[in-house]
C-alpha cells in the first residue's frame, strides 16, 4: 500500500501480504434467498443477476440450496469462511468451483457449497461424480 | 512509469452528484480490470465498483448499487465513476486500482496501482 492510503487497525476491510500486495476482494453472485426450480439436476445455474463486490477481501462465494415440503430456495451470499454460515463451517471455501455438500438439517433437505473464484456460486454443482473425479 | 491520476473531487450537498476520472498512464489499459476504490477518514478501504477491460461488464459494493455508475473509456485510457443521490457516508479519498482479471494480489509494488486520490466530501 502506498503511504498515503492509510492502513487502519484492525480493519478487515483490507488484506495484504508482508511486501505490500493488496488482496483484491471476490465477485460474487449475491441475491440472499430465491426461490428456484433446481431440482433434480447435476448443475445448475443460480439465475441471479446481481453480481456484488464482497465487503470484505477474505469473502468467499457461497450458494445454500434448501428443498422442503413447500419450496425450493437458492441463497447466494458473500461470506468469510473463518465464520460459520448456518451453522456450518466452510470447508471448501479455497475451491474454484461451487460443489454442493448434504448438511444435515431437520425438516429439510440442505445442500451448500462455498468457492473462490469469480462468479463462482452462479454455477452449483451437485453431481457426485463430479466430487470425486474432478481434480479441479 | 505506471501513473494514474484521480480528479473530479469536491465539496457536494447530500443528493447532489459528482464525476470522477482517472487518467491512466504507463500501461496498456485495455488488458486491466479497473477499480474505484474509497478510504473514509479513519475507516479501511472500501471497494466501490469495478469494470472489466473489454466488454464493459461492470460491478459494484451493495453500499453504492443503484447510485453509482462505472465507465471507461478505452480510447482515452479514462476511469470515470458517476455518484448520484450522495450521502454523508459517501465521504472519503477515492482511488482508481488496476487488476489483472483473475489475479487476486496487486503487485508487491506499493506504487504500482495507486493514485494520490481525490477528495469527496458531502455535507450540508
Known amino acids: 500500500i502506498p503511504p498515503h492510503v492509510q492502513k487502519s487497525v484492525n480493519n478487515d476491510m483490507i488484506v495484504t501480504d508482508n511486501n505490500g500486495a493488496v488482496k483484491f476482494p471476490q465477485l460474487c453472485k449475491f441475491c440472499d434467498v430465491r426461490f428456484s426450480t433446481c431440482d433434480n439436476q447435476k448443475s445448475c445455474m443460480s439465475n441471479c443477476s446481481i453480481t456484488s463486490i464482497c465487503e470484505k477481501p477474505q469473502e468467499v462465494c457461497v450458494a445454500v440450496w434448501r428443498k422442503n415440503d413447500e419450496n425450493i430456495t437458492l441463497e447466494t451470499v458473500c461470506h468469510d469462511p473463518k465464520l460459520p454460515y448456518h451453522d456450518f463451517i466452510l470447508e471448501d471455501a479455497a475451491s474454484p468451483k461451487c460443489i454442493m455438500k448434504e448438511k444435515k438439517k431437520p425438516g429439510e433437505t440442505f445442500f451448500m457449497c462455498s468457492c473462490s473464484s469469480d462468479e463462482c456460486n452462479d454455477n452449483i454443482i451437485f453431481s457426485e461424480e463430479y466430487n470425486t473425479s474432478n481434480p479441479d | 512509469e505506471v501513473q494514474l491520476l484521480e480528479s473530479g473531487g469536491g465539496l457536494v450537498q447530500p443528493g447532489g452528484s459528482l464525476r470522477l476520472s482517472c487518467a491512466a498512464s504507463?500501461?496498456?489499459?485495455?488488458?486491466?480490470r479497473m477499480w474505484w476504490v474509497r478510504q473514509a477518514p479513519g475507516k479501511g478501504l472500501e471497494w466501490v465498483s469495478?469494470?472489466?477491460?473489454?466488454?464493459?461488464?461492470?460491478y459494484y459494493a451493495r453500499s453504492v448499487a443503484g447510485r453509482f455508475t462505472i465507465s471507461r473509456d478505452n480510447s482515452k485510457n479514462t476511469l470515470y465513476l458517476q455518484m448520484n443521490s450522495l450521502r454523508a457516508e459517501d465521504t472519503a479519498v477515492y482511488y482508481c486500482?488496476?487488476?489483472?482479471?483473475?489475479?487476486?494480489?496487486?503487485?508487491?509494488?506499493?506504487?504500482?496501482?495507486w493514485g494520490q486520490g481525490t477528495l469527496v466530501t458531502v455535507s450540508s
Open positions: 504507463g500501461f496498456t489499459f485495455t488488458e486491466y
Open positions: 469495478a469494470i472489466e477491460p473489454i466488454g464493459n461488464r461492470t
Open positions: 486500482a488496476k487488476q489483472i482479471p483473475g489475479r487476486k494480489w496487486t503487485a508487491n509494488s506499493r506504487f504500482d496501482y
